[in-house]
Interface confidence: medium
Amino acid sequence: ALDAAYCFRNVQDNCCLRPLYIDFKRDLGWKWIHEPKGYNANFCAGACPYLWSSDTQHSRVLSLYNTINPEASASPCCVSQDLEPLTILYYIGKTPKIEQLSNMIVKSCKCS
Amino acid sequence: ALDAAYCFRNVQDNCCLRPLYIDFKRDLGWKWIHEPKGYNANFCAGACPYLWSSDTQHSRVLSLYNTINPEASASPCCVSQDLEPLTILYYIGKTPKIEQLSNMIVKSCKCS
């Protein structure tokens, strides 16, 4: 799997999970989240050569097409596969609220 | 929806469905498929600016991060959303076989 266990231990030019820490205030301009101040969002990046973690039959076809066809601008892209939620604390007035924001943390990637 | 109805009628630099015809023999080197000779596979391409058909909360976060940090390489990518199967005819010896290959045709796109 193209997850932290594999990607963070290997120098990998191909599609893989990349570390990314996001500071809510600095990076997103969000001032409403009290805790945490930021989180390890991660992201997916890298090339998608033929059969590198292809998600669907279409992405396999596309990467093969990309190998054979000289134009090759139609290629699969490295995107998130498994995502996890993030629990946040914010305030409405003086009332603290705890909420789970779904699909905030990328855990693994795929070529789609 | 970023489908043919919208994308094929508009000149759109952002993430959209693009027409792509694939000839099995010429483009993939596949000689085993008897019919059809090729098909309209389509593909997804284009930029993913903030809130342009974002798939998940993470992709929304990423595109906002990318807007505030323009030098960042962490940005969402335009990929397939809805896919359809393709029915093919091939032969095992002299015996014709009809099979449905899943996820072969892209019908719409998203920023993920």
Epitope: A47, S73 | R26, G46
Partner: antibody, heavy 125, light 112 residues
Framework: EQQLVESGGGLVQPGGSLRLSCAVS????????VNWVRQAPGKGLEWIGY???????YYASWANGRFTISKDSAKNSVYLQMNSLRAEDTAVYFC???????????????????WGPGTLVTVSS | EAVLTQSPGTLSLSPGERATLSCQSS????????LSWFQQKPGQPPRLLIY???TLTSGVPDRFSGSGSGTDFTLTISRLEPEDFAVYYC????????????FGGGTKVEIK
């Protein structure tokens, strides 16, 4: 208007490195493939490689290993990193976009248009 | 690795005459028509004249025409104008994971 402009050329010693930039305007690098082509003084054109809209780079066999193409779509720039430079790498370096035909980035049939004006790289001691 | 051979190396003609330039590929270009023609004048980048072996680029005068398929291609200038004296290059697109493009050595069309 759709434009490409190269920069970063100059004099470099044999064995040295250089990074050329190709700044694009009027179109998105997320939708188009950009090529690098070079031309030695008084000689013909030579294809180096390209980077596709999706970020996949392809190279001529002679360029593989020494030359690396990358891009920063947010900065509207494509780069050509050249290492272990030799005298025979002296040339004008052009970036050129795949022309778009029929509403899709594919099917341009080896058509490069538009081109940048080029930047001269001289490898000499 | 494909090699494109252009002939003649130099063509000496007078304005008003017909010019016929040849481009021969050591292997078939992709789809038999991934062949372009470029015009280059001193100190300028190449200018695309014809793509897909025979399709004239927008703004190019119709005295230019291209023909051929597979491995043999021709660029014809029906009546040479003073501004047509330049160097002409053909470029081919090829299948495979490397050397997707190649340029011919060029033909110089000079005033007799």
């Amino acid at each position: 208007e759709q434009q490409l402009v190269e920069s970063g050329g100059g004099l470099v010693q044999p064995g040295g490195s250089l990074r050329l930039s190709c700044a694009v305007s009027g179109f998105s690098l997320s939708s188009y493939t950009v090529n690098w082509v070079r031309q030695a003084p008084g000689k013909g054109l030579e294809w180096i490689g390209y980077i596709s809209y999706g970020g996949s780079a392809y190279y001529a066999s002679w360029a593989n290993g020494r030359f690396t193409i990358s891009k920063d779509s947010a900065k509207n720039s494509v780069y050509l990193q050249m290492n272990s430079l030799r005298a025979e790498d002296t040339a004008v370096y052009f970036c050129a976009r795949h022309m778009q035909v029929g509403g899709a980035p594919t099917g341009s049939m080896a058509a490069f248009d538009p081109w940048g004006p080029g930047t001269l790289v001289t490898v000499s001691s | 690795e494909a090699v494109l051979t252009q002939s003649p190396g130099t063509l000496s003609l007078s304005p008003g005459e017909r010019a016929t330039l040849s481009c021969q590929s050591s292997q078939s270009v992709y789809n038999n028509n991934y062949l372009s023609w470029f015009q280059q004048k001193p100190g300028q980048p190449p200018r695309l004249l014809i793509y897909g072996a025979s399709t004239l680029t927008s703004g190019v005068p119709d005295r230019f025409s291209g023909s051929g398929s597979g491995t043999d291609f021709t660029l014809t200038i029906s009546r040479l104008e003073p501004e047509d004296f330049a160097v002409y290059y053909c470029a081919g697109g090829y299948s495979g994971s490397s050397d997707k493009y190649a340029f011919g050595g060029g033909t110089k069309v000079e005033i007799k």
